[in-house]
């Protein structure tokens, strides 16, 4: 499967949509900045094999999809852009799932890297908790949008893993 090319293309499209989704000036939201602790050090210090990279990327995209599929998210963003963004993420999930099956076969897809997946889940839990604490305010969503854009571009080591042959 030609995942590196399709993934980076979809990823770029998702990032463009995410960038367009802003509704208020982020300049009014400086005081809402928050440390979400994206697990970049764990990712940077690890050479991901292809199947590992796929499963961690899948988790990141799945969590992002879940985050932007809530009622609170629907209220925060312009509907047509949100739908396009969600569709882009859904397509990425499908691509990754198809690739996993092709790479190792359905019966061999248990979580081989539970630590990394757990780190991603905890990271998204911190984001969800922050939104709840901030009562899903427009600025809180702006901060989260900026953070998701950052985490998407941080996953370079994972993308390197996509090019690797197991």
């Amino acid at each position: 499967c030609d995942l590196p090319q399709t993934h980076s293309l979809r990823n770029r499209r998702a990032l463009i949509l995410l960038a367009q989704m802003g509704r208020i000036s982020p300049f009014s939201c400086l005081k809402d900045r928050h440390e979400f602790r994206f697990p970049e050090e764990e990712f940077d210090g690890h050479q991901f094999q292809k199947t590992q990279a796929i499963s961690v990327l899948h988790e990141m995209i799945q969590q992002t999809f879940n985050l932007f599929s809530t009622e609170d998210s629907s209220a925060a963003w312009e509907q047509s852009l949100l739908e396009k963004f969600s569709t882009e993420l859904y397509q990425q999930l499908n691509d990754l799932e198809a690739c996993v099956i092709q790479e190792v076969g359905v019966e061999e897809t248990p979580l081989m890297n539970e630590d990394f997946i757990l780190a991603v889940r905890k990271y998204f839990q911190r984001i969800t908790l922050y939104l709840m604490e901030k009562k899903y305010s427009p600025c809180a969503w702006e901060v989260v949008r900026a953070e998701i854009m950052r985490s998407f571009s941080f996953s370079t080591n994972l993308k390197k893993g996509l090019r690797r042959k197991d």
Partner: antibody, heavy 121, light 107 residues
Framework: EVQLVQSGAEVKKPGESLKISCKGS????????IGWVRQMPGKGLEWMGI????????AYSPSFQGQVTISADKSISTAYLQWSSLKASDTAMYYC??????????????WGQGTLVTVSS | DIQMTQSPSSLSASVGDRVTITCRAS??????LNWYQQKPGKAPKLLIY???SLQSGVPSRFSGSGSGTDFTLTISSLQPEDFATYYC?????????FGQGTKVEIK
Amino acid sequence: EVQLVQSGAEVKKPGESLKISCKGSGYSFTSYWIGWVRQMPGKGLEWMGIIDPSDSDTAYSPSFQGQVTISADKSISTAYLQWSSLKASDTAMYYCARHPGLNWAPDFDYWGQGTLVTVSS
Amino acid sequence: DIQMTQSPSSLSASVGDRVTITCRASQSIGDFLNWYQQKPGKAPKLLIYFASSLQSGVPSRFSGSGSGTDFTLTISSLQPEDFATYYCQQALDFPLTFGQGTKVEIK
């Protein structure tokens, strides 16, 4: 390597216009904001304003609102600071600096080398 | 606007001395405070961000503390290259504001 490279020193007369530049390299230019800071001779640092190069949204310090214009051209990773009519009191060193926006990361972690603007008749 | 007041405005110290510079904000800014070092003819350099985080590449003799309205920059053992002017800056809200600076001179 992250770099912000500013245009060279300028000597101008009062009433003249001027546009100085700040070119970013070694990072994703649209992922960071660019701020401008003034330092008058022998004085401290004053924040003038900031731009988000991804959409050219700007914010100004009330002291500089209407006095200067901040702009950016993301296609060439360059931010600008301009004056339509310079005054002698605009004589200063002007710095651009990179800001992480709403991300939890160091503010103004990289600075340009500065552009000295001298306004004299 | 949030006013930032540094003290002292200048100090004389010797190599090896422990130096402390304070910065006070006119209202609570949490830990949204940065410290910069500037040498004559050079651009400012970020030392400490979010009150106490040491910027990458900055020697560990520099440390920052404080929260709310009162902040401190400490140089545990002053080195010859540390003679410079130091500025605090609040990062909570626009307009961003700097302290007036503290010049550290050789005694």
